[in-house]
Interface confidence: low
Amino acid sequence: GCLTQLYENAFFRGGDVASMYTPNAQYCQMRCTFHPRCLLFSFLPASSINDMEKRFGCFLKDSVTGTLPKVHRTGAVSGHSLKQCGHQISACHRDIYKGVDMRGVNFNVSKVSSVEECQKRCTSNIRCQFFSYATQTFHKAEYRNNCLLKYSPGGTPTAIKVLSNVESGFSLKPCALSEIGCHMNIFQHLAFSDVDVARVLTPDAFVCRTICTYHPNCLFFTFYTNVWKIESQRNVCLLKTSESGTPSSSTPQENTISGYSLLTCKRTLPEPCHSKIYPGVDFGGEELNVTFVKGVNVCQETCTKMIRCQFFTYSLLPEDCKEEKCKCFLRLSMDGSPTRIAYGTQGSSGYSLRLCNTGDNSVCTTKTSTRIVGGTNSSWGEWPWQVSLQVKLTAQRHLCGGSLIGHQWVLTAAHCFDGLPLQDVWRIYSGILNLSDITKDTPFSQIKEIIIHQNYKVSEGNHDIALIKLQAPLNYTEFQKPICLPSKGDTSTIYTNCWVTGWGFSKEKGEIQNILQKVNIPLVTNEECQKRYQDYKITQRMVCAGYKEGGKDACKGDSGGPLVCKHNGMWRLVGITSWGEGCARREQPGVYTKVAEYMDWILEKTQSSDGKAQMQSPA
């Protein structure tokens, strides 16, 4: 299953399959997730080791048993691949690293005014993988405001150095934020020239294209079909690149198919997995296990559940079957692709779905009347769980925020439904940033059921929590995916990086904002909060957040929206925007429903009709 816990001060011994430099443990974990053999990783931050060569070292590891011995190493961080973790699987990495220089091939330098602009340039440059930006205070004036666009053979820095007044980060192309746009066309009977960066075997050009999309240096590809004239080259997928970023030439060639990486697509990327099953095809590879199952779909499920399995063949040969069950061969290889593809067989083959980010139909948890005042604009995909709850009577308007917590579930505040309990009048918009982008053609979700907490009373602040079951499940994308919930009664975690988001008023007597706003707000103890609200009871089922001096807060229209905190690289839904005295007033923090205190209720209500819990734990 999905394991998300990180082990501090621990290093996995042995099992190395690859190593690289990464700026933090989360990026290392992402590289592990996308590496075909990696199950475990260990990361050495700069502070953890004196050996200059190993600083920022990310060590990817495999193990037949799924685990390795952990040794104590101060400062080291270890953890698991996120294969099988559904919506948490993403190659998108937005963080900016201050005081760090990520080294690589500097192929472009320009002057820009901010690190965000530099990241945008990288994202809009076809060859850029990562970048470094020298700030206004950099000690060499001629380098100040320099934006260096970079690439490397493996897509990760060739070295990482601690360096004052330099900021680094990665291209946001894997976040589907590139302005370049992509070529969806597949060109039949055409072969591209230029440099081959890798060679794999694939059953068709579409798998070849997906592999190209997620390969750090592949910009385009040529696939040789199973009837290509040279037998040894059949089903070969050649991943290619060029200096210019486009093929310098193409040759008409029977039984070849060419196309482009889809990494530069805007708003939608292919899933990093291959779900199609290929009848009459055998995939060869290293044998992991053989099991008897009923049907090829069960064989694929079995492969997906066995984390080391990369692909499978379901044999229908009489000698491989007994009763209704036949042999399911679970296989793997060094590069995640079959080592041999045979046609005209009595088997059916396919791939593990361990990297599909749709996951199962679940809510994400972890084991371990009020807008944003003083906030700033959010960017696409920054808060993909944020939804807008709108009411359509005669006109249509935004009333509340909410948080997507599963394919079919939204968590919000109960008071949003005060006087509007009819599910038919509500429209739920997800995967949006600007309210002005909503037109009559914009897809929305309708409500199947509104579940208001049984102890909630109108005009009272207590138990201000409600669940919405959507009529149809939503697919997950980079712009629309759930937020993880905290563990039950989570009181030990100290959250220091918390944000509130919403389209609500930017001042007490204001108006709904067009662009989703975000504000970084510190949590306040309940004791401190109670002092500020002597006429109200601040219960243990509430959490408060705000600045003593005011100036930043949620406000009208943000109600029901998320208070999220980042801990160990993972965002969790800590609170639901509930109430407060005015907005952003001095010494009047915002009050939020404490989600951890309602985990039993959420679990109970999100159980499916067959009684199976709709909760999945990544930990």
Partner: antibody
Framework: EVQLLESGGGLVQPGGSLRLSCAAS????????MTWVRQAPGKGLEWVSG????????IYADSVKGRFTISRDNSKNTLYLQMNSLRAEDTAVYYC?????????????????WGQGTMVTVSS | DIQMTQSPSSVSASVGDRVTINCRAS??????LAWYQQKPGKAPNLLIY???SLQTGAPSRFSGSGSGTDFTLTISSLQPEDFGTYVC?????????FGLGTKVEVR
């Protein structure tokens, strides 16, 4: 032999000016950033100013900003420090030093070659 | 500015002794630290750069260690010519700053 030789120090009244020079020999002067460091009598070392190899970039400690000007003449292999509006607290031995980049990017600095120093006394 | 604090301010030792000098930065400076030896009336002389790398020409009895905020210069076997003041310097961020020095006297 790699060498730096300072000159131009002496006694000057408060508010006065002085120009220090540092002659470099034994290495390709134009490839190196240079710096001035001073040491008041009985006190510790204090970084004063730095200049990039081309002379295009200059940096100063807050204590001398607006009063001191660092410059260089690569054709003469010489580094300069023009000191105006001198104060009693500027009294020190002034060293010029070569900036050694031990990190290949040229971003992290240590001072590997030093001159013998020249004494500047500001007193009425 | 980053403050560099050295301890002890002076140390008296005999020839052949192992001498340890400490330097603490007021904030994390990674490994951007240099050590210099300075004799009375003379200019400083670079011994160690990048916290632990020995400068060409410096005797191998000198070694540096540490990372972050705490650093150490060690003289494994003190020699008569090792008397003088040892100064640490950070090159992590401007302005470059020096410690006040540790005076090593030969007993």
């Amino acid at each position: 032999e790699v060498q730096l030789l300072e000159s131009g120090g002496g006694l000057v009244q408060p508010g006065g000016s002085l120009r220090l020079s540092c002659a470099a020999s034994g290495f390709t002067f134009s490839l190196y950033d240079m710096t001035w460091v001073r040491q008041a009598p009985g006190k510790g070392l204090e970084w004063v100013s730095g200049i990039s190899s081309s002379g295009g970039v200059t940096i100063y400690a807050d204590s001398v900003k607006g009063r001191f000007t660092i410059s260089r003449d690569n054709s003469k292999n010489t580094l300069y420090l023009q000191m105006n509006s001198l104060r009693a607290e500027d009294t020190a031995v002034y060293y010029c030093a070569r900036t050694y980049y031990y990190d290949s990017s040229g971003y992290a600095d240590a001072f590997d070659i030093w001159g013998q120093g020249t004494m500047v006394t500001v007193s009425s | 500015d980053i403050q560099m604090t050295q301890s002890p301010s002076s140390v008296s030792a005999s020839v052949g002794d192992r001498v340890t000098i400490n330097c603490r930065a007021s904030q994390d400076i990674s490994n951007w630290l240099a050590w210099y030896q300075q004799k009375p009336g003379k200019a400083p002389n670079l011994l160690i750069y990048a916290a632990s790398s020995l400068q060409t020409g410096a005797p191998s009895r000198f070694s540096g260690s540490g990372s972050g905020t705490d650093f150490t210069l060690t003289i494994s076997s003190l020699q008569p010519e090792d008397f003088g003041t040892y100064v640490c310097q950070q090159s992590y961020s401007l302005p470059w700053t020096f410690g006040l020095g540790t005076k090593v006297e030969v007993r």
